[in-house]
Interface confidence: medium
């Protein structure tokens, strides 16, 4: 058969939950401390909560059935009677009473024809303000007749015909009634919830609803123009040109900020947005939903997309509607011909209307932002340049922040990219130019996206002119080739000599993408004499070992994930892993990762790696001539740097011998 409507699916679930109590029994959830009852869907059944409030399960006859004394469940179908009597069956006795008062209406309800009545419950009538009720029953009951006729449709309409966003023609001046049928099974009529649906009568059908409904005369724009509390919103809508949409056809939800909502925003923020047509349009579109959403439809958290594109979490807490967890809706379900308005007393500013400063203020990067400000870069972060800010997380600075000197200023300038980027469009090998004039490289890994040594730690926040990338560490732009990096650091004097001896200098100086695991002088010194002699005694062997320390792509620590097998220039693979924020290569910890170079990255290690296919062979402790040159250079370099190279006695003697 045809697909069941959401209402029918929920009813079916309630029937399923109630069947152990007999035929045609439905499980109903009642919110504790209220008279609010709901047929139950799967999620609510297990959570036992509606709008965050606890519920109790009771078991009632499903619509259209009744109990039979001495029998289990609700085996009997309700006897069919006319509409007037059916009002009594569904418990809408107040509607019966008012029908009697009109004199004209009861004969219609008892006579021939086919009608639908959306009958307000007794509680709905009782909750009407006294003055409203008085006005209905005065004027020779004509107002009452009109009101009741507005609750009626001149044909039989069952819930399976009640489609989301449809309008029905009422029997009062052919005025429209708005129907919404939500995915959670809730059906509303002018935002009043259907409590008991599809009660058949001989001449129609009765649906019990939880409110007295009234005619809708104004569109959203007209309501904004009428209400004093929307004075600022009115001006903003006019300035943005959105009034055409808000008075046109369609079904929207306007989360309408009151004057008070605008007053909560600092003047400078408000002036900036109001003076910027694009930001203003984004701000207003962030308060408009693409369809009408009545308060009664919200029984739990629901993600909705605004016209601006931001996702809002609409929820409820008891009787209060919430947006992003905050109870900021002060007046709900103001109906318009083209949708529904909820008054809100806090402005929902989308990222797209914010400066980089404002985006950063809502992220975990406040320490970095203070550094940018102190470094005199504030104007870039609040101006109209198209920029991307690479802002390290606060946790990066847990041990303190650097002093603001020329070096820090320059470093910070290299955290600002001269373009407004989106991470989803970045690609591996892309270069990005910074305000400091540096070119930064993009590395795309399986589970991370990195810019130089720093990886993106949170979703982008795209502002009016700037985008915020939250980064997992301070970014260090490359200062030279791998060879420059190694030569510029005293710890690597022996490695530099070894590279030169092995003829790899040119490789590590030219353009390329290398990951170098760089053993320190201590690593070389820690080698047993046998290993050292093997390593240094043969330039070809030395080149082989050194190539095993060089990966053929750039792998920064943020790109490792759990384990990466990195192919070395020697041919064998290096096992690079990350555990508890410590990088290891072949299970040996890296002392200092991520020293960036223009043609690669250097990771400092304190041991020399041995290729698996190249196990040490027994050798004498004689030192080959080719290797002596290495140590002569390394030793001289070390002395020049006021570091002594402590060599094993046999080498010391050989070096002494060389001097004579």
């Amino acid at each position: 058969g045809p697909a069941k409507s959401p209402y029918q699916l929920v009813l079916q679930h309630s029937r399923l939950r109630g069947r152990q109590h007999g035929p045609n029994v439905c499980a109903v959830q009642k919110v504790i401390g209220t008279n609010r009852k709901y047929f139950t869907n799967c999620k609510q059944w297990y959570q036992r909560k509606i709008c965050g409030k606890s519920t109790v399960i009771s078991y009632e006859c499903c619509p259209g059935y009744e109990k039979v004394p001495g029998e289990k469940g609700c085996p009997a179908a309700l006897p069919l009677s006319n509409l007037y009597e059916t009002l009594g069956v569904v418990g809408s006795t107040t509607t019966q009473l008012y029908t009697d008062r009109t004199e004209k209406l009861r004969p219609e309800m008892e006579g021939p024809g086919s009608f639908t009545i959306f009958a307000p419950s007794n509680e709905a009538w009782a909750s009407l303000p006294a003055e409203v009720l008085d006005s209905l029953v005065s004027n020779v009951n004509i107002e009452l007749l009109n009101a009741l006729r507005y609750h009626m449709v001149g044909r039989r309409v069952l819930t399976d015909e009640l489609k989301h966003g449809m309008t029905l023609t009422s029997m009062y001046q052919n005025s429209n009634i708005q129907i919404h049928h939500y995915p959670n099974g809730i059906v509303t009529v002018n935002c009043a919830r259907l409590l008991k649906a599809d009660h058949h009568a001989t001449n129609g059908v009765v649906h019990l609803i939880d409110k007295v409904i009234s005619t809708i005369t104004n569109n959203i724009q007209q309501i904004i123009e009428i209400e004093d509390t929307f004075e600022t919103l009115r001006a903003a809508v006019a300035a943005s040109g959105l009034n055409t949409m808000l008075e046109g056809n369609g079904q929207y939800t306007l989360l309408a900020p009151t004057n008070e909502a605008f007053e909560k925003i600092p003047s400078e923020t408000l002036n900036r947005i109001l003076g910027d047509p694009e930001a203003l349009r984004d701000l207003l579109n962030n308060h408009i939903l693409k369809s009408a959403m009545c308060a009664e439809a919200i029984v739990a958290g629901l993600s909705v997309e605004t016209l601006e594109g931001t996702t809002l979490e609409v929820g409820c807490s008891g009787d209060m509607l919430t947006i992003n967890g905050k109870a900021i809706i002060s007046n709900k379900d103001i109906l318009a011909t083209n949708g529904v308005i909820h008054y809100i007393d806090e402005l929902l500013i989308p990222d797209s209307a914010k400066t980089l400063f404002e985006l950063a203020a809502e992220s975990d990067v406040s320490t970095a932002i203070d550094l940018f400000r102190q470094a005199g870069l504030g104007n870039h972060l609040s101006g109209s340049e198209r920029l991307t800010l690479l802002a390290p997380l606060n946790s990066v600075f847990k041990d303190g922040t650097p002093p603001i000197d020329a070096h820090t200023r320059n470093l910070l300038r290299n955290h600002i990219i001269k373009d407004q980027l989106a991470s989803k469009y970045l690609y591996h090998g892309q270069t990005l130019e910074t305000l400091g004039g540096k070119k930064l490289r993009v590395f795309v890994y399986r589970n991370s996206l990195c810019i130089e040594n720093s990886c993106i730690a949170a979703h982008d926040k795209r502002g009016r002119y700037g985008t915020l990338f939250t980064m997992d560490r301070v970014l260090t732009p490359p200062m030279g080739t791998v060879m420059d990096v190694l030569k510029g650091d005293n710890r690597f004097s022996m490695l530099v000599a070894a590279i030169q001896s092995a003829g790899l200098t040119e490789t590590l100086n030219r353009e390329g993408v290398y990951t170098v695991f760089a053993p320190t002088n201590e690593a070389f010194r820690a080698l047993p004499p046998r290993e050292r002699s093997r390593l240094l005694g043969d330039a070809k062997e030395l080149a082989n070992i050194l190539k095993y320390h060089i990966g053929d792509e750039i792998l920064v620590s943020g790109g490792i994930g759990a384990l990466v097998r990195l192919k070395s220039l020697q041919g064998d693979k290096l096992e690079v892993s990350l555990k508890n924020n410590v990088v290891s290569v072949n299970k040996e910890p890296v002392a200092e990762p991520d020293i960036m170079a223009t043609n690669g990255v250097v990771h400092v290690i304190t041991n020399v790696l041995q290729p698996p296919a190249n196990r040490p062979q027994e050798r004498g402790d004689e030192l080959a001539d080719s290797a002596l040159e290495i140590f002569k250079q390394a030793s001289a370099f070390s002395r020049a740097s006021q570091r002594s190279v402590r060599l094993a006695p046999v080498y010391q003697k050989l070096l002494e011998r060389m001097k004579h």
Epitope: T355, E358, A361, N379
Partner: antibody, heavy 120, light 113 residues
Framework: QVQLVQSGAEVKKPGSSVKVSCKAS????????MYWVRQAPGQGLEWVGT????????YYAQKVQGRFTITRDSSTSTLYLELSSLRSEDTAVYYC?????????????WGQGTTVTVSS | DIVMTQSPLSLPVTPGEPASMSCRSS????????????LAWYLQKPGQSPQLLIY???TRESGVPDRFSGSGSGTDFTLKISRVEAEDVGVYYC?????????FGQGTKLEIK
């Protein structure tokens, strides 16, 4: 370094007008919000008005709205405050002030002040 | 308008001793979206223009000695001087930049005993 050099003292009669100037140097003038703050003799500080970085927006204290006008000339990096329909209660030292940056509104750098005396 | 109220109006202090002054606003200066307090402190030394000491309620302006510290949130703020020096005399003003019109407190006059 940042400098805000204001024009000299003025003595004026009630009902008359005067234009006070403030010459900025040591920073990109067009990148900053600028402010005027005044201090009546023996009294505290009172914000008079603000002009945006591009000179498009100006905001005034209610007391001076309609009588005072703030303008700026980016070509000469000069800020102006024109005081008209002067009253005796406008007697004060008027300070030219630079904001922190393009939007944020605290008063980072102050001029030396211009004394305006309104007396019959 | 947001009214700023400072206390005490006069604060005699012995050099080397700490000093503390208060500033209260008639409405909250904490902007929930960025959790920043839109409050600044200034010092006006005798015969001089005012100078900025603190912004965002607690961020010290560069060049301001670290004996000055700002604290507080919402409507109640405090400026503390850990050890007063002779050069600290003058009038201290708090100011809100949360909403136009920007307003100052009436000032606290710090003098040496």
């Amino acid at each position: 370094q940042v400098q805000l050099v204001q024009s000299g003292a003025e003595v004026k009669k009630p009902g008359s007008s005067v234009k006070v100037s403030c010459k900025a140097s040591g920073f990109t003038f067009s990148d900053y919000y600028m402010y005027w703050v005044r201090q009546a003799p023996g009294q505290g500080l009172e914000w008079v008005g603000t002009i945006s970085d591009g000179g498009i927006y100006a905001y005034y204290a209610q007391k001076v709205q309609g009588r005072f006008t703030i303008t700026r000339d980016s070509s000469t990096s000069t800020l102006y405050l024109e005081l008209s329909s002067l009253r005796s209660e406008d007697t004060a030292v008027y300070y030219c002030v630079r904001g922190w940056d393009r939007y944020d509104s605290w008063f980072a750098c102050w001029g030396q002040g211009t004394t305006v005396t309104v007396s019959s | 308008d947001i009214v700023m109220t400072q206390s005490p109006l006069s604060l005699p202090v012995t050099p080397g001793e700490p000093a503390s002054m208060s500033c209260r606003s008639s409405q909250s200066l904490l902007y929930s979206s960025n959790q920043k307090n839109y409050l600044a402190w200034y010092l006006q030394k005798p015969g001089q223009s005012p100078q900025l000491l603190i912004y965002w309620g607690s961020t010290r302006e560069s060049g301001v000695p670290d004996r000055f510290s700002g604290s507080g949130s919402g409507t109640d703020f405090t400026l503390k001087i850990s050890r007063v020096e002779a050069e600290d005399v003058g009038v201290y003003y708090c100011q809100q930049y949360y909403r136009y019109p920007y307003t100052f407190g009436q000032g606290t006059k710090l003098e040496i005993k």
